[in-house]
Amino acid sequence: KLTIESTPFNVAEGKEVLLLVHNLPQHLFGYSWYKGERVDGNRQIIGYVIGTQQATPGPAYSGREIIYPNASLLIQNIIQNDTGFYTLHVIKSDLVNEEATGQFRVYPELPKPSISSNNSKPVEDKDAVAFTCEPETQDATYLWWVNNQSLPVSPRLQLSNGNRTLTLFNVTRNDTASYKCETQNPVSARRSDSVILNVLYGPDAPTISPLNTSYRSGENLNLSCHAASNPPAQYSWFVNGTFQQSTQELFIPNITVNNSGSYTCQAHNSDTGLNRTTVTTITVYAEPPKPFITSNNSNPVEDEDAVALTCEPEIQNTTYLWWVNNQSLPVSPRLQLSNDNRTLTLLSVTRNDVGPYECGIQNELSVDHSDPVILNVLYGPDDPTISPSYTYYRPGVNLSLSCHAASNPPAQYSWLIDGNIQQHTQELFISNITEKNSGLYTCQANNSASGHSRTTVKTITVSAELPKPSISSNNSKPVEDKDAVAFTCEPEAQNTTYLWWVNGQSLPVSPRLQLSNGNRTLTLFNVTRNDARAYVCGIQNSVSANRSDPVTLDVLYGPDTPIISPPDSSYLSGANLNLSCHSASNPSPQYSWRINGIPQQHTQVLFIAKITPNNNGTYACFVSNLATGRNNSIVKSITVSA
């Protein structure tokens, strides 16, 4: 089939395009090209007769077209008007016509864009800025870059006007960045120069340094003020409300008690017109004052926050002392004292760090104590506990579940059933339950102060019939004469009888066997190797009874005192000595031999061929059980006679 391929399909203005013909029939008389989707004499571009190799321009010929013998058409110096469809009309020798249509699109080469802004000096948290990418170009795509990255997702960033305009609402100082726009069309892409947004902000609340507020008479007072601001702030100082000077630093030498008072730093931004002040109270002491403790965090979060307790006032050449719970400081990697001992930092506080804390200032005559300070440590919630612990309930009873999680402040609770929220209470009560109340019951504990949440999920089954039980154990490999083992029959269910069997028999009477927890738990105290039996638990209620699969207790024991065989101790010279050692043990022990105290081999059997009187001596077998950590040995004297 006759087809036309445009190379390229998207053509830049001023460039050229080739309309390439595929599957041209044989035995042709000639062909003509037309502008448009159909053959129209008024829109003929050029005709070509193969026999004469003669090309004839038509009404739509612009002088920029070249036709090739293979019927392909080259159009040069493309203009916007050239966009559209082109139809090739082929006349075969048998005068049967065939047509094919192709098309291309013309796009301009884009100029380098530039950014215009409606506000060159926007004010933080007040102004919006609209950047517009110039010029406006048809069929162009507009893109934006911030610090050479694509636009971040933000409710304060809005694109409009076909992405040509980028608006930043409520600008912040963090919007101070390099902005670029890019225009793209199918034939070109251009990026603008960067525009730096200059956001006016501040002044923030000034910071007065040093933080030290207590001074002794005779010292120099040197206060510095700083406030984040663009443009930089202008500073003024006031003492007890009276203007002092317009500088960033305030210096008063050789202060006295009269210099005590409120020191105010005022920061002013002439562009935003805003003022902010910070006041610090300076106390000049003639004598060391009664100390007091300040904290940088009155409600620290457990395992998250550090707390710095500072003993005030700061007095040069003074010894600071600390007490916790009326004791001197314990040694702990979480407790750190500053070089001057004035600040006690608790790293990663825990709920046990509440205190009380006291600090003291030591002078020539005595130690002045501060009042005690107690920390309010926010913690939790821990994993909630749902009680009671039953997992099986029979239909018709009331279901009453209570949830508790250690938390400060106390947790807020929510209950979910199969993921659906039920109520925001600590207790969940459902009367007259049915099988439909079976499901996953989730208690969610939330600490509003720390923002932490923890959940516990409990599967509740409502069924008159009990499941097949199983046995859980708190110790899968107990050691003889040392460990106790508690077997528990699962699940825990209301109105249920629990039964136990050992090796298919009901429980023997023994002071080492104890039933507890409504017969649900069977405890074996001081296990022995004879307790290595098959244990089965059973549950029964009004409509069902079931036994668990047996659980066999694997008791680790030994090694017992070994036995060396044969028992003979006298041998004739030339005989073979073949000693075997055995010790009752679980797991099997490791064996080793020593002859006259000298280590030999790590085997159960010791073999020496053709012994002589030189082989007289003590033969010791050593046994070791790695699981119980116990060892044993036996010594045998061997006499070889000539």
Epitope: G396, A464, E465, S506, G538, N541, S542, V543, A545
Partner: antibody
């Protein structure tokens, strides 16, 4: 060996009542639950309910609430089923049965059944 | 209440033939139990908790299923197996039985 011996057949007038007994041997009824099941002529099995002889707790099928009453006498190791306001629909064989506590089987021990015929 | 539907109602089988009886519950149950009853006798438990063989029951009996669909299978029919078989659920009150399937010897 466990056995449940039920009382003999009963012929009762419509509107009357009857008390059936089931005496256990080979085990203590306080250690288990006693269930009652009935079977109408040429019909299937119908569960009536159970009693816990240890504390007198009962559970009845809704259909038999007010119709059947369970009691026990632990001194004679006997369970009783009283039926009231009898109609011809109550003509059936009534079975007692229990699940042994020493194993996983329930409805394993059955009485031989008591035939109750209600005449008009 | 949970209605149990047994099928077929009546089935005939030759000695040695495999027989399967099904029981469908109107609501999901945790297990199914099967009883055998011969004329003039009390019911006898054959399968408990879906698939466990009751004491003294031949190994040719087996049970399976879950949710709402359960079955009892006799791998090779014998003359003594001719009886009516009932399924029973104990998950919810009231406890209910199926209407029964009568197994006849062909």
């Amino acid at each position: 060996q466990v056995q449940l011996q039920q009382s003999g057949a009963e012929l009762v007038k419509s509107g009357g009542s009857v008390k059936l007994s089931c005496t256990a041997s080979g085990f203590n009824i306080k250690d288990s639950y006693m269930h009652w099941v009935r079977q109408g002529p040429e019909q299937g099995l119908e569960w009536i309910g159970w009693i816990d002889p240890e504390n007198g707790d009962t559970e009845y099928a809704p259909k038999f609430q007010g119709k059947a009453t369970f009691t026990t006498d632990t001194s004679s190791n006997t369970a009783y089923l009283q039926l009231s306001s009898l109609t011809s629909e109550d003509t059936a064989v009534y079975y007692c049965n229990e699940g042994t506590p020493d194993g996983p089987y329930y409805f394993d021990y059955w009485g031989q059944g008591t035939t109750v015929t209600v005449s008009s | 209440e949970n209605v149990l539907t047994q099928s077929p109602a009546i089935v005939s089988a030759s000695p040695g033939e495999k027989v399967t009886i099904t029981c469908s519950a109107s609501s999901s149950v945790s297990a199914m139990h099967w009883f055998q009853q011969k004329p003039g006798t009390s019911p006898k438990l054959v399968i408990y908790s879906t698939s466990n063989l009751a004491s003294g029951v031949p190994a040719r009996f087996s049970g399976s299923g879950s949710g709402t669909s359960y079955s009892l299978t006799i791998s090779r029919m014998e003359a003594e197996d001719a009886a009516t078989y009932y399924c029973q659920q104990r998950s919810s009150y009231p406890l209910t039985f199926g209407a029964g399937t009568k197994l006849e010897l062909k």
